[in-house]
């Protein structure tokens, strides 16, 4: 199904405008900001979601050590350019002609430059590390139960194939979820780990992107799991290119 037929809404993306003007009077939904048609049976790409967010009213808004090449999204929100498939274009520029290269999750991976900056290809983010700290509880969660619950969540809520959840680490109060998805592993129809991570991030912040679906209520054997901070690290198939001055 492309959208909920009975009341013509998009279950997987509330930032859409839907109408029964598809083939045969079918419900068709378009993303705010870009006007691109979206498939409401799966997650919408992060690029289209960011674009929609920027067009919306402003108020609508053993542990692994990340490698030296891991990126954190320090730049925050921007109005991205998306390709016809809804993916980030490799080169992004702002209104003042400042340009930079991004990876497949839209995070900057080069220094900023001018309009002459070249970004030859969209580099794939193949490994995402989601680092969470949960609020204090009476005791630690059972690791196996926590692990299974988070894997279930990514399967059921985000439709991410279980093979892409590489590991769940837990050292109270820190939880780390590792998502891995190489270009060769991703088949047609598979949810992208970057999109799943973005939906999860928004859910954790209480800003669910789902339509008519309750907010995220994470429980482990009935015990609420409340997250107090989230950090997401992105690792690309090709390491980022920053000059030394950025590191000082």
């Amino acid at each position: 199904h492309t959208a909920a037929q009975d009341n013509c809404t998009c279950p997987t993306n509330k930032m859409t405008v839907c109408s029964p003007d598809g083939p045969g009077g079918r419900c068709q939904c378009r993303a705010l900001g870009s006007g691109m048609a979206v498939d409401c049976s799966t997650l919408t790409s992060k690029c289209l979601l960011l674009k929609a967010r920027m067009s919306a009213p402003k108020n609508a808004r053993t542990l692994v050590r990340p490698s030296e090449h891991a990126l954190v999204d320090n730049d925050g929100l921007y109005d991205p350019d998306c390709d016809p498939e809804g993916r980030f274009k490799a080169r992004q520029c702002n209104q003042t002609s400042v340009c930079w290269c991004v990876n497949s999750v839209g995070v900057r991976r080069t220094d900023k430059g001018d309009l002459s900056l070249r970004c030859d290809e969209l580099v794939r983010t193949h490994h995402i590390l989601i680092d969470l700290r949960h609020r204090p509880t009476a005791g630690a969660f059972n690791h196996s139960d926590l692990d299974a619950e988070l894997r279930r969540l990514f399967r059921e809520r985000y439709r991410l194939h279980p093979k892409f959840v590489a590991a769940v680490h837990y050292e109270q109060p820190t939880i780390q979820i590792e998502l891995r998805q190489n270009t060769s592993q991703k088949a047609a129809g598979d949810v992208d780990i970057g999109d799943a991570a973005y939906y999860f991030e928004r859910d954790i912040k209480g800003e669910s992107l789902f339509q008519g679906r309750g907010g995220l209520d994470l429980r482990v054997r009935g015990e609420p799991l409340q997250v107090e901070r989230t950090l997401i690290y992105y690792l690309d198939e090709i390491p980022p290119k920053f000059s030394m001055k950025r590191l000082t």
């Epitope: 399967r155 059921e156 439709r159 093979k163 590489a166 309750g214 054997r221």
Partner: antibody, heavy 117, light 106 residues
Framework: QVQLQQSGPELVKPGASVKMSCKAS????????IGWVKQRTGQGLEWIGE????????YYTEKFKGKATLTADTSSNTAYMQLSSLTSEDSAVYFC??????????WGQGTTLTVSS | QIVLTQSPAIMSASPGEKVTMTCSAS?????MYWYQQKPGSSPRLLIY???TLASGVPVRFSGSGSGTSYSLTISRMEAEDAATYYC?????????FGGGTKLEIK
């Protein structure tokens, strides 16, 4: 094509244990999840638990903690369920089923367990 | 845990007749799944994500609903549809099934 072949019927005495198998073919074993479901004669379906084959992560429903033990041998593409301290209440057909982005998309043919003295 | 209640428990229909069965959840679920089971066989996935037909399922089957109320409809009953139908949720652990609706042919 995807197939889940379960082991044959078992007749065991009360108090004993039994280990049944579910041999998978037609897909990459470690990419998926195997769930187990109980069905007593003339009754409905009852979920027991599941095992993530790539990581070995296991979840049991509260009722089957201590009763069922789920394991998998990735070298032979086989999932196992052991049931211990058997009573007549454990007499049932037990199904294994594959999980992906669906809870159960393919099912085995079932293993009939009879507990009788 | 989320309890799923199916009704009716048993029903019968004549060939060509429209059939509707329901599944009520004790608390809201995101999607409902439906399985068909014939005597001596294992269950078969019929409908996923509330309304999407699984591969090979005839178009006379349809599913609908949201929140706590879901239904399965067969537009025109056929003899081969005589079976027991189970609804199932996985919005939270433990996964649960409804008690089943046994559909007989008149």
């Amino acid at each position: 094509q995807v197939q889940l072949q379960q082991s044959g019927p078992e007749l065991v005495k009360p108090g004993a244990s039994v280990k049944m198998s579910c041999k998978a073919s037609g897909f990459t074993f470690t990419d998926y999840v195997i769930g187990w479901v109980k069905q007593r004669t003339g009754q409905g379906l009852e979920w027991i638990g599941e095992i993530y084959l790539g990581s070995g992560t296991i979840y049991y429903t509260e009722k089957f903690k201590g009763k069922a033990t789920l394991t998998a041998d990735t070298s032979s593409n086989t999932a196992y369920m052991q049931l211990s301290s058997l009573t007549s209440e454990d007499s049932a057909v037990y199904f294994c089923a594959r999980g992906s982005i669906f809870p159960f998309d393919y099912w085995g043919q079932g293993t009939t367990l009879t507990v009788s003295s | 845990q989320i309890v799923l209640t199916q009704s009716p428990a048993i029903m019968s229909a004549s060939p060509g007749e429209k059939v509707t069965m329901t599944c009520s959840a004790s608390s809201s679920v995101s999607y409902m799944y439906w399985y068909q089971q014939k005597p001596g066989s294992s269950p078969r996935l019929l409908i996923y994500d509330t309304s999407t037909l699984a591969s090979g399922v005839p178009v006379r089957f349809s599913g609908s609903g949201s929140g706590t109320s879901y239904s399965l409809t067969i537009s025109r009953m056929e003899a081969e549809d005589a079976a027991t139908y189970y609804c199932q949720q996985w919005s939270s652990y433990p996964y649960t099934f409804g008690g089943g609706t046994k559909l007989e042919i008149k």
